[in-house]
């Protein structure tokens, strides 16, 4: 992980300066280096029952380095901390331990959930919704026109999505009945949504002039061409299918 | 709870010598690095020195070297800093501060002031 | 040595105020930044260390950022006992420097 690490090289006498191996400025044949060239870190590794002297690129995982004037040193960290500001500041904490405030924890304290992607005590975000909309214009069948009765929707934006243990979101969009006056549809406004559409021919079934839905017309002041019940309906579709079968025939 | 309570700090003629004390508790003071930083009436901190956490090592700012010197005793988890030669610039509080990189402990001062 | 320069020295604000206070070092330091704030009378006391990690403690209305050479110390909503003076320090090697300060003071 570091480069440049230096160890004893061959037998010498415990204070010998020739013959380092490595970023070693001086070194024994005991303590490995006991000081490095410029701009290494020093750091004492433990092997078995002795320290033995490195010098480093940079410090080691669970180890910070201070810079001081005649030597850079590497410092260890706390046991349960992976990479630390210095001995009080914790800044990445070992596996199974969650940072919060510079200090390693076994679990988040309440009020705050463990972000197991950054292993931090984050706190806990609950769900944010916009003001609603305005309703939307009232339609059936994504029509404006031709009928009385129909729905409009209202929605609302997510501001802030929750974190895991946060409040869920409430609905985003709502749909109620609406009532409209009335009204002819005028050439070309069949389309969906009140969008301008021109249709060559009326679909099998449909009349050219609006049908209000049955009940609509429970409560509709009836115009007399509209005055017709269901059989007379049902009679005046057959009546254009077969209109539109000898239009046919004769061709 | 950790605390740092200097002492030592008065009024003293130039040339003259002063010692100022440091007792530490609330946290273990042999695994700290302790620094002195003063601060001059109305003016900004300014670091003064700092001694490693054995006594092995010490640094100092320019304008103190040769004058200063800064000793602990961690059987006594106390800091000193023996002021020599003060001069009318040297007027400050002087803080007391466990030093790891950052200031992380400070004491509440003891006010040093170097007048004829 | 590394010299710290921060900007403004004094700033007016009024409580609920956004502030930001900028620090200069004169060579990169990566992170190793550490902001204090201090009260007359008052020891300074360590707000973020590692340029943007608040100390345990402190609210979460201060935060800070920056890397290298440019640093900043921002409060989100100025409240009453924010009035003081900050100080950053750079900790990336010795000897410690501090900025000059900057004095926050009541509009």
């Known amino acids: 992980q570091n480069a440049s690490r230096g160890r004893r090289q061959r037998r010498m006498h415990p204070n010998v300066s020739q013959g380092c191996q490595g970023g070693c400025a001086t070194c024994s044949d005991y303590n490995g280096c006991l000081s490095c060239k410029p701009r290494l870190f020093f750091a004492l590794e433990r092997i078995g029952m002795k320290q033995i002297g490195v010098c480093l690129s940079s410090c080691p995982s669970g180890y910070y380095g201070t810079r001081y004037p005649d030597i850079n040193k590497c410092t260890k960290c706390k046991a349960d901390c992976d990479t630390c500001f210095n001995k009080n500041f914790c800044t990445k904490c070992k596996s199974g331990f969650y940072l919060h405030l510079g200090k390693c924890l076994d679990n988040c304290p309440e009020g705050l959930e463990a972000n197991n992607h950054t292993m931090e005590c984050v706190s806990i975000v609950h769900c944010e919704v916009s003001e609603w909309n305005p309703w939307s214009p009232c339609t059936k069948k994504g029509k404006t026109c031709g009928f009385k009765r129909g729905t409009e929707t209202r929605v609302r934006e997510i501001i802030q999505h929750p974190s895991a243990k946060g409040n869920l979101c409430p609905p985003t969009n709502e749909t109620r009945k609406c009532t409209v006056q009335r009204k002819k549809c005028q050439k070309g406004e069949r389309g969906k949504k009140g969008r301008e559409r021109k249709r060559k021919k009326p679909n099998k079934g449909e009349s050219k002039e609006a049908i209000p839905d049955s009940k609509s017309l429970e409560s509709s002041k009836e115009i007399p061409e509209q005055r017709e019940n269901k059989q007379q309906q049902k009679k005046r579709k057959v009546q254009d299918k077969q209109k539109s079968v000898s239009v046919s025939t004769v061709h | 709870e950790v605390q740092l309570v200097e002492s030592g700090g008065g009024v003293v003629q130039p040339g003259r010598s002063l010692r100022l004390s440091c007792a530490a508790s609330g946290f273990t003071f042999s695994d700290y690095d302790m620094a002195w930083v003063r601060q001059a009436p109305g003016k900004g901190l300014e670091w003064v020195a700092t001694i490693i956490y054995d006594g092995s090592r010490t640094y100092y700012r320019d304008s103190v070297k040769g004058r200063f010197t800064l000793s602990r005793d961690n059987s006594k988890n106390t800091l000193y800093l023996q002021m020599n030669s003060l001069r009318a610039e040297d007027t400050a509080v002087y803080y007391c501060?466990?030093?790891?990189?950052?200031?992380?402990?400070w004491g509440q001062g003891t006010m040093v002031t170097v007048s004829s | 040595d590394i010299q710290m320069t921060q900007s403004p020295s004094s700033l007016s604000a009024s409580v609920g105020d956004r502030v930001t206070i900028t620090c200069l070092a004169s060579?990169?330091?990566?992170?190793?930044l550490v902001w204090y704030q201090q009260k007359p009378g008052k020891a300074p006391k360590l707000l973020i260390y590692?340029?943007?990690r608040l100390q345990d403690g402190v609210p979460s209305r201060f935060s800070g950022s920056g890397f290298g050479t440019d640093f900043t110390l921002t409060i989100s909503s100025l409240q009453p006992e924010d009035f003081a003076t900050y100080y950053c320090q750079q900790s990336y090697k010795y000897l410690p420097t501090f900025g000059q300060g900057t004095k926050l003071e009541i509009k």
């Open positions: 501060a466990a030093h790891d990189r950052s200031f992380d402990y």
């Open positions: 060579e990169d330091i990566s992170n190793d």
């Open positions: 590692a340029a943007s």
